[in-house]
């Protein structure tokens, strides 16, 4: 029977008595930076080319005995998970291995850098099809390792890495913290985050998604026909590298941004039990388990968006936090969140020729997060329209006045320390979809975009008294681009998008007493692209 | 050890003619920074990645590495260039005493220096 991990990543349509999805990644080359490997193991023979690259530190300890099967264990297993004949994800993918980890599974940042440079030079000397680089390793945060990953990603290479096995914030480790890298956490057969001894999978905003990483059957270097079960975020990353290879084999022109968005889009949503994560990390950690797309083609018509959280601003009064989209993504909306509720909103602003999302802390606040909604919108022309505080009783409003521009997101930013004391709040008048409305003492920012066939609509859901959170979701075929709260009173902690749902969090005021005027509304902006839909129909 | 002594002598001879001091001092106001792993047991002091500014050519990287070796030799320190980076990031990997960091940070074209550290199979 099919191993649990392969079943988990396989859409029902492929589930027969065996795992045999179409096109096993045959157009893609996967580079593995790991230990030495037993390349003639029956599972992977002929699929892995061992390069002559080796850069490893000496093993620790004077009595260390170098046993070949132990030296090869980690890398052989991962090569099997990626492309093994019987237990691999992308059975058609060819691999190249570089040895950057010694027999104890230890390497150096410098050795890894030289390995990445070797891959770049190989790519320049002999350009092939799409490249995936699997980095099943982690060290402490490294500016230089992250920078090298960024350069390689900008050269068109897809990098996939382990989130780390330290039951900690992945942002404290490299290459897991590099934004350009696809960072993978580990889950088990029960969709629980993986526990490894006293530790376990890393988590947090630097994780892109999770994948099977416990009791994963794969090639064992103990003998040429042996299999063994291993666990860790390396195994999880190997699954995603395999899925990426298959996606790229089906659509070789996919960019890194497109691939990442597809990986997120086709993941199983909201299946992980978040109680395992520290409370302050739950909102930041994506509840996504990787899966293959149900069909290898035809996803192009969708408007893909993802949520990007910033680092925490820190508690100083003027502290700000910035969330950025990838180079070929569009920032379609910007929101903010503070656990204390003390914040001064958010705004979209240009930085280095690109829009970023900046959130502002307030006096006495413990800090804020900026939350960017980053989307793939070809031929888009987006701009931000701002209205300064109106000071009048009707509140501040701003709309998209340019012909053919639609509203994709609303942000509001205020200088006063506590909007909640400045009554009355105001609800947006209905029937004006291209308009953002906010508190009279806030400046309002509208994200207005023109793109072929783009249409958007506003959905609202309000409840009379805040009960912790209000949500509103976009229906099938529509994608959430904007998420904001009305009104911006002090008990609103912030708004953020989770997949296609807009979540507005507020303090539960049932203990302090509430009035009807303290109603909270979640406002979602849902968009779709008729142009992308038509283009995909013409292709089919 | 003999090898290293040999290298050291050769370097001193080869570079004695190079001007001392910091001829191409970094532009005013831009100071190179030093980074090291926050997790102490993972640090590998004595090996450093010197990262140069983005548009630095390979020849400039090599020249900067040689200049560091020459200035270190004049101060009685042995250094070894383990690798010169080009293709992804400009820079070089150097084995040297941490005492030389201040000197290295003042070299022309230097963006930042990072102490090497360990990575682990996950």
């Amino acid at each position: 029977s099919i191993p649990w991990n392969l079943e988990r990543i396989t859409p029902p349509r492929y589930r027969a008595d065996e795992y045999q999805p179409p096109d096993g990644g045959s157009l893609v080359e996967v580079y593995l930076l790991d230990t030495s490997i037993q390349s003639d193991h029956r599972e992977i023979e002929g699929r892995v080319m061992v390069t002559d690259f080796e850069n490893v530190p000496e093993e620790d300890g004077t009595r260390f005995h170098r046993q070949a099967s132990k030296c090869d264990s980690h890398g052989t297993h991962l090569a099997g998970v990626v492309s093994g004949r019987d237990a691999g994800v992308a059975k058609g993918a060819s691999m190249r291995s570089l040895r950057v980890l010694n027999c104890q599974g230890k390497g150096t940042v410098s050795g890894t850098l030289i390995g990445l440079e070797f891959i770049r030079k190989s790519q320049l000397v002999q350009p092939v099809g799409p490249l995936v680089v699997l980095l099943p390793l982690a060290g402490g945060y490294s500016r230089v390792l992250n920078a090298a990953c960024q350069r390689l990603a900008r050269a068109g290479v897809v990098l996939v890495t382990a989130a780390g096995n330290f039951r900690d914030d992945a942002c404290l480790y490299s290459p897991a913290s590099a934004p350009e890298v696809i960072t993978v956490g580990a889950t088990n057969a029960q969709d629980q985050p993986v526990t490894l001894g006293t530790l376990g999978t890393n988590f947090g905003r630097c994780v892109d998604l999770f994948a099977p990483g416990e009791d994963i059957i794969g090639a064992s270097s103990d003998c040429s026909t042996c299999f063994v079960s291993q666990s860790g975020t390396s195994q999880a990353a190997a699954h995603v590298a395999g899925i990426a290879a298959m996606m790229l084999s089906a659509e070789p022109e996919l960019t890194l941004a497109e691939l990442r968005q597809r990986l997120i889009h086709f993941s199983a949503k909201d299946v992980i039990n978040e109680a395992w994560f520290p409370e302050d990390q739950r909102v930041l950690t994506p509840n996504l388990v990787a899966a293959l797309p149900p069909s290898t083609h035809g996803a192009g018509w969708q408007l893909f968006c993802r949520t990007v959280w910033s680092a925490h601003s820190g508690p100083t009064r003027m502290a700000t936090a910035i969330a950025r989209c990838a180079p070929d993504e569009e920032l379609l909306s910007c929101s903010s969140f503070s656990r204390s509720g003390k914040r001064r909103g958010e705004r979209m602003e240009a930085q280095g020729g690109k829009l970023v999302c900046r959130a502002h802390n307030a006096f006495g606040g413990e800090g804020v997060y900026a939350i960017a909604r980053c989307c793939l919108l070809p031929q888009a022309n987006c701009s931000v329209h701002t209205a300064p505080p109106a000071e009048a009783s009707m509140g501040t409003r701003v709309h998209c006045h340019q012909q053919g521009h639609v509203l994709t997101g609303c942000s509001s930013h205020w200088e006063v320390e506590d909007l909640g004391t400045h009554k009355p709040p105001v609800l947006r008048p209905r029937g004006q979809p291209n308009q953002c409305v906010g508190h009279r003492e806030a400046s309002i920012h509208a994200s207005c975009c023109h793109a072929p066939g783009l249409e958007c609509k506003v959905k609202e859901h309000g409840i009379p008294a805040p009960q912790g959170q209000v949500t509103v979701a976009c229906e099938e075929g529509w994608t959430l681009t904007g998420c904001s709260a009305l009104p911006g009173t002090s008990h609103v902690l912030g708004a953020y998008a989770v997949d296609n749902t807009c979540v507005v969090r507020s303090r539960d005021v049932s203990t302090t007493g509430s009035t009807s005027e303290e109603a909270v509304t979640a406002v979602a902006i849902c968009c779709r692209s008729r142009h992308l839909a038509q283009a995909s129909q013409e292709l089919q | 050890q003999e090898d290293e002594d040999g290298d050291y002598e050769e370097l001193v001879l080869a570079l004695r003619s190079e001007e001392d001091g910091l001829a191409e001092a970094p532009e005013h106001g831009t100071t190179a920074t030093f980074h090291r792993c926050a997790k102490d047991p993972w640090r590998l002091p004595g090996t450093y990645v010197v990262v140069l500014k983005e548009e630095t050519h390979l020849s400039q990287s090599e020249r900067t590495a040689r200049r560091l070796q020459a200035q270190a030799a004049r101060r009685g320190y042995l250094t070894k260039i383990l690798h010169v980076f080009h293709g992804l990031l400009p820079g070089f990997l150097v084995k040297m005493s941490g005492d030389l960091l201040e000197l290295a940070l003042k070299l022309p074209h230097v963006d930042y220096i990072e102490e090497d550290s360990s990575v682990f199979a996950q």
Partner: antibody, heavy 115, light 109 residues
Framework: QVQLVQSGAEVKKPGASLKVSCKAS????????ISWVRQAPGQGLEWMGW????????NYAQKVQGRVTMTTDTSTSTVYMEVRSLRSDDTAVYYC????????WGQGTTVTVSS | QSALTQPASVSGSPGQSITISCTGT?????????VSWYQQHPGKPPKLMIY???NRPSGVSNRFSGSKSGNTASLTISGLQAEDEADYFC?????????FGGGTKLTVL
């Protein structure tokens, strides 16, 4: 191109030993092991075992375990198979083939065991 | 006694299609994706025609195709030609070794 070249035909007496060689070329040797297969006259194929060109590890078929030894000489890219205590039913064509997938075969070595 | 069962012979006329079966157990054919088919002409070494159930090596005619259902694998040759007359052997992984079928003699009438 990928090639496996075997040593020439042999005639052996029962009880003797046999050593057949197989020289590999045209591919990355460590990416594949070498399988040995024999075929008795007018019969089917019988898998005898496999040897790793990477680390010399072996995997023998139960039937021949103890009587067969496979070795490699990486310096010459040559794999050897020795069969001891030959019997008349060891008369066969012995083939080496690349890996477990056996996608490339040697030309075969005819071995006759007769008194 | 071979571990995998094949019909001793099959025949077909030029242009026709024939199928050769290869039956094993869940410990070999049914348990692995690695079923191969070999063609052997008299006095020649075997030649790989199909690997991993249904994949064709480069240079092998697309008239040859492979499939598997449960514990039985099949080789289909369409548009039979005179040069297809040969012995055909299937093979499969087992947990620790390899097994072959007894072989099928294909006669092109």
């Amino acid at each position: 191109q990928v090639q496996l070249v075997q040593s020439g035909a042999e005639v052996k007496k029962p009880g003797a030993s046999l050593k057949v060689s197989c020289k590999a070329s045209g591919y990355s040797l460590t990416s594949y092991g070498i399988s040995w297969v024999r075929q008795a006259p007018g019969q089917g194929l019988e898998w005898m075992g496999w040897i790793s060109a990477y680390n010399g590890n072996t995997n023998y078929a139960q039937k021949v375990q103890g009587r067969v030894t496979m070795t490699t000489d990486t310096s010459t890219s040559t794999v050897y198979m020795e069969v001891r205590s030959l019997r008349s039913d060891d008369t066969a064509v012995y083939y080496c083939a690349r890996g477990y997938g056996m996608d490339v075969w040697g030309q075969g070595t005819t071995v006759t065991v007769s008194s | 006694q071979s571990a995998l069962t094949q019909p001793a012979s099959v025949s077909g006329s030029p242009g026709q299609s024939i199928t050769i079966s290869c039956t094993g157990t869940s410990s070999d054919v049914g348990g692995y994706n690695s079923v191969s088919w070999y063609q052997q002409h008299p006095g020649k070494p075997p030649k790989l025609m199909i690997y991993e159930v249904s994949n064709r090596p480069s240079g092998v005619s697309n008239r040859f195709s492979g499939s598997k259902s449960g514990n039985t694998a099949s080789l289909t040759i369409s548009g039979l030609q005179a040069e297809d007359e040969a012995d055909y052997f299937c093979s499969s992984y087992t947990s620790t070794s390899m097994v072959f079928g007894g072989g099928t003699k294909l006669t092109v009438l």
